[in-house]
C-alpha cells in the first residue's frame, strides 16, 4: 500500500508569492510560492495519485502582514481552500496568546489540529477541549492512517501560551499515544510536528511504533541529488534514522515560506511497516501556475492590506534617527527605538527568580534603512516602518557565550569609519570602545543587563557565562560578518516579523520619543573626548 | 466543550419507523463529519451512516441501504437518521459521532467525539 505524504512547514504567512529569498515579490516571473501556486501541485499530485495526505507541521502564523491585520483568520480560510488534512502546533500559533489561537484557527480549521504534549489545565481545560487533538486518525482510501501531533516545548519562552497550558517533554507524550493508535489496530503512524530537526531525529529513534516524522520549526532543507535554488541541503530526503528497535524511519523537513511542498511517497506493508521511502522537496517556481480561484481570493482579501498599512499606529514627538551617517557610526535612537521593541516583545515572566528570560539585543546598524520624521504630525504608519525595516526578517531569540558576545563587538567596529552595516546598535548592553587601539582589542568595557534580579541593573560580561540575546535572524545566520554567532551559538529560534514587532510595540506606546542615551560609547584612547 | 446527544430511541414493533436525532454543541456542526454506529447486545459496534460536513455525501452500510436515511440541519445543529421498515436485527444502542475532515468514513476508529447513545429495540 503506498502512502504520498506532502508536507510544509514554517510558511510564516506567506500566503502570496515571494521573491526567490521569500521576502516581498518584485519581480513576478521569478517568483515562488503563495498558496495558489501550492493549490496547483497539491491538485495536481492528487489527480495523479490514490492515497494522497496533506500535511502542515507548524507556524503559518507570523511573518507579514497578513497576519498582522487577519491574525490567524487567513491561515483557517486558506488551509481550508486548500483541503490540509491535517496541521500540527507551532510555538508561533500561540503568539497572540490562546484566545488568538482558538477564535481564528481552532474553531475555524474543517481539519484536524494536533499536539500530543500541550496540556491544558484550569478554566481553559474545557474551554480548549476537543478544538486540538492529541493524534488523529485519517481515513486515506480503504485503509487509516495515524497521525500523532507535536509542538516545542520552549514555547513559554518563544510566544504567549498563558498559564494554563502545559508543554511536556515531546517523547514521554508521544508514546502513550502512539500505544492507543496501535490498540485500535492503527499500524501506519506518523509523527507530525514542531519541534526542530534534531527532536524529530529523537522521535524516530526512540517513540516505538512512528513510521515517519514529518517535523518543522527549524527550516530544515534535505534534498537528495542537485538543489533546484539557493538552499543548502543539510542531508538527504527523506533523512533516515534507525529506531532503537532497529527499524529505518524516514524523517522529513520542507525548508519554510512556502517555497517547497515536501513530498513523500511510503510504501507500506500489509502489516503498517515501511518497505520503501523516497521523494524530495518540490521547487514552487514559476514553472507552475497559480491557481486562479485561489490567486482570486487572495486578491480580495488583499484589499484590506493595502487600506491598513497607511493607518497611523503611532506618533512620535523626535526626529527617529536611522540614517547610515549616524547608524552605522553612533548609536542612534532609531536602533535604540527597535532593540526596546525587541525586548518588549519578549517579556515573559515564566521564572520568579528573573524579572525576565532575556534582557539583552544587538542589531546591526545597516539593517536600519530610514530615517521618520516627526515633522508629519509625528505619524507613524506600516508603510514607514516598511521603509526603515524592508527586508522581511524575524527578530530571533539566540544563546551564547559571553566570549563570543565579546568577539561580535569587535567585529562591530573591526573596520571602523568606513559606514559598514555592521556597527551594532543595542538593548540592555553598554560598550565602550576605544579606536585608538587595533582591531580585535578595541571593547574596553562590555556590562550587561541582569536578569536575575528584581532590580535589573548592569554587570561586566563574563566570557564563559551562556546569554540570551534578542537579535535579527540575518546575524543569527552570519550576516555582515557575524560568522561567529553562527557558528558558536548555542540555541537559535525563529522569532516574530521584524516590523509587527515595532509596529506592536509603537502602538502600545502611542507615543514615543527615543533618546540617544550613552549605551555606545567610543573614544580614541589618548583625547577621552566621546563621540555622539 | 463538545458535545453530542442522542434521542428519539424506543420500543417499535417489526416494520415500523423511527427517527433518531443527535443534537450537537460546542461546535460548528458543518465543518464536522456526522456518523451513526449501533451496538448490538454482545457484538462489535458497526457503521450505519454517515454525512459529511456540508451535507453533500452520505454513506449507509449494505445492511440499512434503502431503509435508513441520514440528514441534518447545520441551522439547528442537528443530525437525523430516519430508520423506516426495521428488522429485529436492528436492534442494539444508536450513538452519533463526530470528525473534522474531508472524507466521511463509516470507521468508528476515525471519529473523535461521540454521543452516549440511545436504545432502539425491535420486537413484537
Known amino acids: 500500500w503506498e502512502l504520498t505524504i506532502l508536507h510544509t512547514n514554517d510558511v510564516h504567512s506567506r500566503l502570496e508569492q515571494t521573491s526567490e529569498d521569500s521576502s516581498k515579490c518584485v519581480n513576478a516571473s521569478r517568483c515562488m510560492g503563495g498558496v495558489a501556486r501550492l493549490f496547483t501541485k497539491v491538485q495536481q499530485i492528487r489527480r495523479a495519485e490514490p492515497n494522497v495526505l496533506l500535511l502542515d507541521a507548524g507556524d503559518q502564523y507570523q511573518g507579514t502582514i497578513w497576519f498582522t491585520v487577519y491574525k490567524g483568520a487567513e491561515v483557517a480560510h486558506f488551509m481550508n481552500a486548500l483541503r490540509y488534512d491535517a496541521m500540527a502546533l507551532g510555538n508561533h500559533e500561540f503568539d497572540n496568546g490562546v484566545e488568538g489561537l482558538i477564535e481564528p484557527l481552532l474553531k475555524e480549521a474543517k481539519f484536524p489540529i494536533l499536539s500530543a504534549n500541550i496540556k491544558a489545565k484550569g478554566p481553559l481545560a474545557s474551554q480548549i477541549s476537543g478544538l486540538y487533538l492529541p493524534y488523529k486518525v485519517l481515513p486515506v482510501g480503504d485503509e487509516v492512517v495515524g497521525i500523532v501531533g507535536y509542538t516545542s516545548k520552549e514555547t513559554p519562552f518563544l510566544s504567549n501560551p498563558g498559564t494554563n497550558l502545559v508543554f511536556e517533554d515531546e517523547i514521554t507524550a508521544l508514546q502513550p499515544e502512539v500505544d492507543k493508535l496501535k490498540t485500535l489496530n492503527v499500524n501506519k503512524i506518523i509523527a507530525l510536528g514542531h519541534s526542530g530537526f534534531e527532536m524529530d531525529k529523537l522521535i524516530a529513534q526512540k517513540v516505538r511504533g512512528v513510521d515517519v516524522v514529518v517535523g518543522g520549526h527549524s527550516n530544515t532543507f534535505l534534498y537528495t541529488g542537485n538543489p533546484p535554488s539557493k538552499e543548502v541541503p543539510a542531508g538527504k530526503y527523506p533523512f533516515i534514522v534507525t529506531s532503537d528497535d532497529g527499524r529505518k524511519v524516514p524523517v522529513v523537513q520542507a525548508y519554510a515560506f512556502g517555497k517547497y511542498l515536501g513530498y513523500l511517497k511510503i510504501e507500506f506493508d500489509e502489516r503498517g511497516n515501511v518497505i520503501s521511502s523516497h521523494g524530495n522537496p518540490i521547487l514552487l517556481n514559476s514553472s507552475i501556475p497559480e491557481d486562479p480561484s485561489i490567486k482570486a481570493d487572495i486578491n480580495k482579501w488583499r484589499i484590506k492590506l493595502d487600506n491598513y498599512s497607511t493607518q497611523e499606529l503611532g506618533k512620535t514627538i523626535v526626529y527617529l534617527d536611522g540614517s547610515s551617517q549616524s547608524c552605522r557610526f553612533r548609536e542612534c535612537n532609531m536602533g535604540n527605538l527597535i532593540c526596546d521593541a525587541m525586548i518588549n516583545n519578549n517579556l515573559r515572566h515564566t521564572d520568579e527568580m528573573f524579572w525576565n528570560h532575556v534582557s539583552m539585543c544587538i542589531l546591526n546598524g545597516g539593517g536600519i534603512r530610514s530615517p521618520i520624521d516627526e515633522r508629519n504630525n509625528g505619524t507613524i504608519t506600516w508603510e514607514n516602518l516598511a521603509a526603515v525595516l524592508p527586508f522581511g526578517g524575524t527578530f530571533d531569540l539566540v544563546q551564547l557565550k559571553g566570549s563570543t558576545l565579546k568577539k561580535a563587538f569587535e567585529h562591530s567596529v573591526h573596520r571602523y569609519g568606513q559606514s559598514t552595516g555592521e556597527f551594532l546598535q543595542v538593548g540592555g548592553i553598554h560598550v565602550v570602545y576605544d579606536l585608538s587601539r587595533k582591531p580585535g582589542d578595541r571593547v574596553v568595557k562590555l556590562d550587561v543587563l541582569c536578569t536575575k534580579c528584581r532590580v535589573p541593573s548592569y554587570d561586566p560580561l563574563k566570557m564563559d557565562e551562556v546569554y540570551k540575546v534578542i537579535l535579527p535572524n540575518f546575524l543569527a545566520n552570519g550576516g555582515d560578518g557575524f560568522q561567529m554567532i553562527k557558528d558558536e551559538l548555542l540555541r537559535h529560534d525563529s522569532g516574530d516579523q521584524d516590523i509587527n514587532v515595532v509596529s506592536t510595540y509603537i502602538s502600545k506606546m502611542k507615543v514615543i520619543y527615543p533618546a540617544v542615551e550613552g549605551r555606545i560609547k567610543a573614544h580614541h584612547h589618548h583625547h577621552h573626548h566621546h563621540h555622539h | 466543550a463538545l458535545q453530542l446527544v442522542e434521542s428519539g430511541g424506543g420500543l417499535v414493533q417489526p416494520g415500523g419507523s423511527l427517527r433518531l436525532s443527535c443534537e450537537v454543541s460546542?461546535?460548528?456542526?458543518?465543518?464536522?463529519?456526522i456518523g451513526w454506529f449501533r451496538q448490538a447486545p454482545g457484538k462489535e459496534r458497526e457503521g450505519v451512516s454517515c454525512s459529511s460536513g456540508s451535507g453533500g455525501s452520505t454513506y449507509y452500510a449494505d445492511s440499512v441501504k434503502g431503509r435508513f436515511t441520514i440528514s441534518r440541519d447545520n441551522a439547528k445543529n442537528t443530525v437525523y437518521l430516519q430508520m423506516n421498515s426495521l428488522k429485529p436485527e436492528d436492534t442494539g444502542v444508536y450513538y452519533c459521532?463526530?470528525?473534522?475532515?474531508?472524507?466521511?468514513?463509516?470507521?468508528?476508529?476515525?471519529?473523535?467525539?461521540w454521543g452516549q447513545g440511545t436504545e432502539v429495540t425491535v420486537s413484537s
Open positions: 460546542g461546535f460548528t456542526l458543518d465543518y464536522y463529519n
Open positions: 459521532a463526530a470528525y473534522r475532515g474531508w472524507h466521511p468514513s463509516l470507521d468508528a476508529r476515525v471519529y473523535d467525539y
